[in-house]
């Protein structure tokens, strides 16, 4: 039986916490402060690589306003929050005869069918192909007629009932009934050329963070979709070596627009799935972009249904400081969609780009006549603004020197949001509700639940937000709880990680410090993973773990078991991270500081942070290293190439080396275009290669996967060439056929082992 709610609050307290954060610092070490007398084992590299100590999650899927599905011993169970009981929804033996390993499942909203996914083949970060079968839960049998084809690219149930939309060979199909033939919606799909209902590479990675480009209306009548045309988009080509027996490597070709290159074009359509006919082709009605977008290159960046017959589209200029939201209504008499100019809402940034990464999504009230949206206020902090669709102006309903991270739910009475307001800690996250009838009535729902253990929350609401799951991810061990929105009462503990806590009692765990330094009258936050029995009178080597991309955050209150845990616990290395200029969730003054100037302030601030750390008295300033991946690899390389003399060595994994090599959407958001009229000078000034000479002063390990579709191997190849050309001795490692994550089991173990050896050698550790 689960621990009762009230009892739990007293458990896993300070004594049992593996890590604790307060400002400025609390260091907790169980047992003696004397390291020599502590006979417990440390957290080793093997512990990290073999995942010896597993954090338990509690993953659920809401299927109604009071029920969710979850997995237990491979059975699918349904939990009823109304009655507080579980029952078996589907036993694991149901598909014993299926003959395939099921990768995932999805229940139709009416609970009649279950979609089974198998033959999963990964493509890019989000995209994959798979095979699907449909199981009839009433008849307790698989549907064998009119099956969905193999290598399907995306499938989704309608929000109600059991219609299915899927994409196969870049075309969209709709099934009204799972056992009946599909209706073909589009006929133009062509591999690497025309994408209907799915994203091309750059839209997947940088715009929608998804493969899907399909949007059902709330009642499943309409299906909206985007069509991307990559005809003119240049291809990135790289070798894929595959099995040893392959005599000639395969060449992978992907339409990938680099900065300044030809971009995909986009069109948007809506089809009425209630009027599909087997006699005539489906009629898709196009909604064109606003005139202010059609004058040049632009993106579709958000699609949100407001009501059954009202849809909002957000469009963004290629120069991403100007966006337009269109609100379009269905006209039954003509069958067309009308987007009134009077209902257009323009969002501009005068200091940088729109949104954190793209314009935020609107959250519409039930009648669809108004919406709430996170935008920057007068002081440059991101807050919730209330819009009426027929009015130009919005009024902010939150305010302060903190930011709203996301709007999580909207009911007729309350808006629920996550912010980092509590105790002025940008690296914290808490759930709040604001009363819609009186915006002055704001309540923090999570702040005081378990304030030592839990300072970083995310949330999952039931369909109509009657219940919610709170997911606390730090600073203590993750804790999952269930709550009722009626009175915000905690109903039960779903997972408290008590088994892991017990295991970690026997391990010398590091502690985490979260604090800030003040530079030019501005607070900049950092975190330090400190070795067990940390003694500020001693000198420790320090590794700066960097990302530092726009709107990033590395100093937070999250509990992690990772490579840094090993380095601190076993090797007694301090692992620090610093959020300098360009980092997020602290206002636009900090975030937009690097606008049009990547490779400047965010790089300088990491160097300055290391200088500040070395002044703290417990850092051995002859043993300071830096490492990072992706953008962090770029910053690491720029730092090491700065000639600062602060760092002895560093590791760059899959780094960007020159912004003209990276994709258009991400790069141009921050850098503009690489043209003489725009920002070419800074594109050329911000390369790693231009700093090659300075690498003679440091030890450098450069690592990249050869099949990186995101940050191309080309980027490290050019660093390598530049270093060789000026006679720099450096270390390098490539990972054959690995992508940006270098995540295959063997490669993952190899890279972290290799990096560990490098760091230990740099720090003269045994």
């Amino acid at each position: 039986m689960k621990t009762p709610w009230k009892v739990l609050l007293g458990l896993l307290g300070a004594a049992a916490l593996v890590t604790i954060i307060t400002v400025p610092v609390v260091l907790l070490n169980k047992g003696t402060d004397d390291a020599t007398a502590d006979s417990r084992k440390t957290y080793t590299l093997t512990d990290y690589l073999k995942n010896t100590y597993r954090l338990k999650l509690y993953s659920l899927r809401w299927i109604s306003d009071h029920e969710y599905l979850y997995k237990q011993e491979n059975n699918i169970l349904v939990f009823n929050a109304e009655y507080g009981n579980s029952s078996v929804f589907l036993e694991n033996s149901t598909f014993d005869e299926f003959g395939h390993s099921i990768n995932d499942y999805s229940i139709s909203p009416d609970g009649q069918f279950i979609l089974l996914e198998y033959n999963y083949v990964k493509q890019w970060r989000h995209s994959y192909t798979a095979s699907y079968d449909i199981y009839d839960l009433n008849k307790r049998q698989l549907i064998t007629e009119e099956r969905i084809p193999n290598n399907t690219q995306w499938v989704t149930w309608s929000p109600v009932g059991h219609k299915l939309a899927y994409v196969w060979n870049n075309d969209i199909y709709v099934k009204i009934e799972p056992n009946l033939p599909s209706y073909r919606i589009t006929w133009t799909g062509k591999e690497d050329i025309i994408y209907n209902g799915i994203t091309d590479w750059v839209y997947e990675e940088e715009v929608f963070s998804a493969y899907s480009a399909l949007w059902w209306s709330p009642n499943g009548t309409f299906l909206a979709y985007a069509q991307f045309n990559d005809t003119e988009v240049p291809l990135i080509e790289y070798s894929f070596y595959s099995d040893e027996s392959l005599q000639y490597p395969k060449t992978v070709r992907v339409p990938y627009p680099k900065a300044g290159a030809v971009n995909p074009t986009v069109k948007f359509f809506v089809v009425n799935t209630d009027s599909l006919s087997s006699v005539t082709n489906a009629t898709s009605i196009q909604i064109t972009a606003p005139a202010s977008m059609l004058i040049g290159d632009h993106y579709l960046c958000d699609v949100t249904w407001a009501t059954q017959e009202r849809i909002s589209l957000q469009w963004l200029r290629r120069i991403q400081n100007y966006s337009v939201m269109d609100i379009c209504d269905y006209d039954e008499s003509s069958g067309r969609w009308n987007c009134l100019v009077a209902r257009q809402h323009i969002e501009m940034s005068t200091t940088g780009w729109v949104g954190r990464f793209r314009p935020s999504e609107p959250h519409f009230t039930l009648d669809g006549n108004s919406f709430y949206k996170i935008i920057s206020n007068e002081e440059g902090y991101r807050h919730i603004c209330y819009f009426q669709i027929d009015k130009k102006d919005c009024t902010f309903i939150t305010k302060g020197t903190w930011e709203v991270i996301g709007i999580e739910a909207l009911t007729s009475d309350y808006l629920y949001y996550i912010s980092n307001e509590y105790k002025g800690m940008p690296g914290g996250r808490n759930l709040y509700k604001i009363q819609l009838s009186d915006y002055t009535k704001v309540t923090c729902l999570s702040c005081e639940l378990n304030p030592e253990r839990c300072q970083y929350y995310s949330v999952s609401f039931s369909k109509e937000a009657k219940y919610y799951q709170l997911r606390c991810s730090g600073p203590g061990l993750p804790l999952y709880t269930l709550h009722s929105s009626v009175n915000d009462k905690g109903l039960r503990v779903l997972e408290d990680n008590s088994a892991l806590d017990k295991m970690l009692q026997n391990v010398q765990m590091p502690s985490k410090k979260l604090d800030f330094i003040i530079l030019n009258e501005t607070k900049f936050w950092y975190q330090m993973i400190l070795p067990p029995h940390f003694d500020k009178s001693k000198k420790y080597p320090l590794l700066l773990d960097v990302y530092a991309g726009p709107c990033s955050q590395k100093a937070d209150t999250v509990f992690r078991l990772n490579w840094a845990t090993y380095l601190a616990s076993t090797e007694n290395i301090i692992v620090a991270s610093f959020d300098g200029r360009g980092s997020g969730y602290q206002g636009d003054k900090i975030m937009h500081a690097i606008n049009r100037r990547l490779g400047t302030f965010e790089v300088e601030d990491q160097i300055e942070a290391a200088r500040q750390f070395s002044k703290m008295g417990f850092v051995d300033n002859k043993r300071i290293a830096i490492w990072g991946w992706s953008y962090g690899g770029y910053v690491t390389s720029m730092v090491l190439g700065s000639g600062s003399g602060v760092f002895k060595c560093g590791i760059a994994v899959a780094p960007v080396s020159r912004w003209e090599y990276y994709d258009s959407v991400y790069t141009e958001r921050y850098m503009g275009l690489p043209t003489p009229e725009d920002n070419l000078d800074h594109y050329r000034n911000s390369t790693v290669m231009s700093r090659a000479e300075n690498f003679k002063q440091v030890e450098y390990l450069l690592i990249h996967g050869t099949a990186d579709d995101n940050v191309h191997f080309q980027q490290s190849a050019q660093i390598s060439k530049a270093l060789v050309d000026v006679g720099v001795d450096f270390q390098a490692m490539w990972y054959t056929d690995e992508d940006h994550g270098i995540a295959s089991s063997t490669a993952h173990q190899h890279i972290y082992t290799h990096m560990s050896h490098f760091i230990k050698q740099c720090f003269s550790l045994p």
Epitope: T350, N377, E378, I397, T440
Partner: antibody, heavy 122, light 107 residues
Framework: EVQLVESGGGLVQPGGSLRLSCAAS????????MSWVRQAPGKGLEWVAF??????????EYSASVKGRFTISRDNSKNTLYLQMNSLRAEDTAVYYC?????????????WGQGTLVTVSS | DIQMTQSPSSLSASPGDRVTISCRAS??????LTWYQQKPGQAPKLLIY???RLHSGVPSRFSGSGSGTDYTLTISSLEPEDFATYYC?????????FGQGTKVEIK
């Protein structure tokens, strides 16, 4: 410290024109909506016009009583707000205040200038 | 346009008195009601916005309440510096409109 200082008021004949200025300091001028509010002698307050911030394209709104005759504008390089008043009438006689608009829980005039008197008389 | 009607037009009170001023809108303004204080020869000052939210630096003896179309400004204990004219303003819908004012005089 936020400061708003109006100037440009005076005596003008009916049908004439006048341009009022408002010099702003102590805040990031381009980030705020700015407004003009007037007060006829011995009477109440009347909203005249506002101009949006840079992020909203400096677009404008007017009360019906001045629409087509008055134009609100801003010179952001000088941190100055203007009100160009044409076709002036006797009923436009008032103290004209420039005010900063705070868009939080509504649209509030959170800082005001000291006002400048405009007299329309023959 | 939304009409704003204040009552009374004027009132006489003594320091220490509790004073209440009413403001009625011709239609629902959803709490978007602001109160200003103006002293002779001075510009108005923001007191309360969104029905009940005190502007920074405003003493806590001032409070606002109401909903829909009817709103109230209350001064719990009148101080000598509170003798002034008070205006309500709706900022729910353009054009923004003010009440005609309530003059609070010394008895």
């Amino acid at each position: 410290e936020v400061q708003l200082v109006e100037s440009g008021g005076g005596l003008v004949q009916p049908g004439g024109s006048l341009r009022l200025s408002c010099a702003a300091s102590g805040f990031t001028f381009t980030n705020y909506y700015m407004s003009w509010v007037r007060q006829a002698p011995g009477k109440g307050l009347e909203w005249v016009a506002f101009i949006r911030d840079k992020a909203n394209g400096y677009t404008t709104e007017y009360s019906a009583s001045v629409k087509g005759r008055f134009t609100i504008s801003r010179d952001n390089s000088k941190n100055t707000l203007y009100l160009q008043m044409n076709s002036l009438r006797a009923e436009d006689t008032a103290v004209y205040y420039c005010a900063r608009v705070l868009r939080y829980l509504g649209y509030n005039f959170d800082y005001w200038g000291q006002g400048t008197l405009v007299t329309v008389s023959s | 346009d939304i009409q704003m009607t204040q009552s009374p037009s004027s009132l006489s009170a003594s320091p220490g008195d509790r004073v209440t001023i009413s403001c009625r809108a011709s239609q629902d303004i959803g709490n978007f009601l602001t109160w200003y204080q103006q002293k002779p020869g001075q510009a108005p000052k923001l007191l309360i916005y969104y029905r009940s939210r005190l502007h920074s630096g405003v003493p806590s003896r001032f409070s606002g309440s109401g909903s829909g179309t009817d709103y109230t400004l209350t001064i719990s204990s009148l101080e000598p510096e509170d003798f002034a004219t008070y205006y309500c303003q709706q900022d729910n819908t353009l054009p923004w409109t003010f009440g005609q004012g309530t003059k609070v005089e010394i008895k």
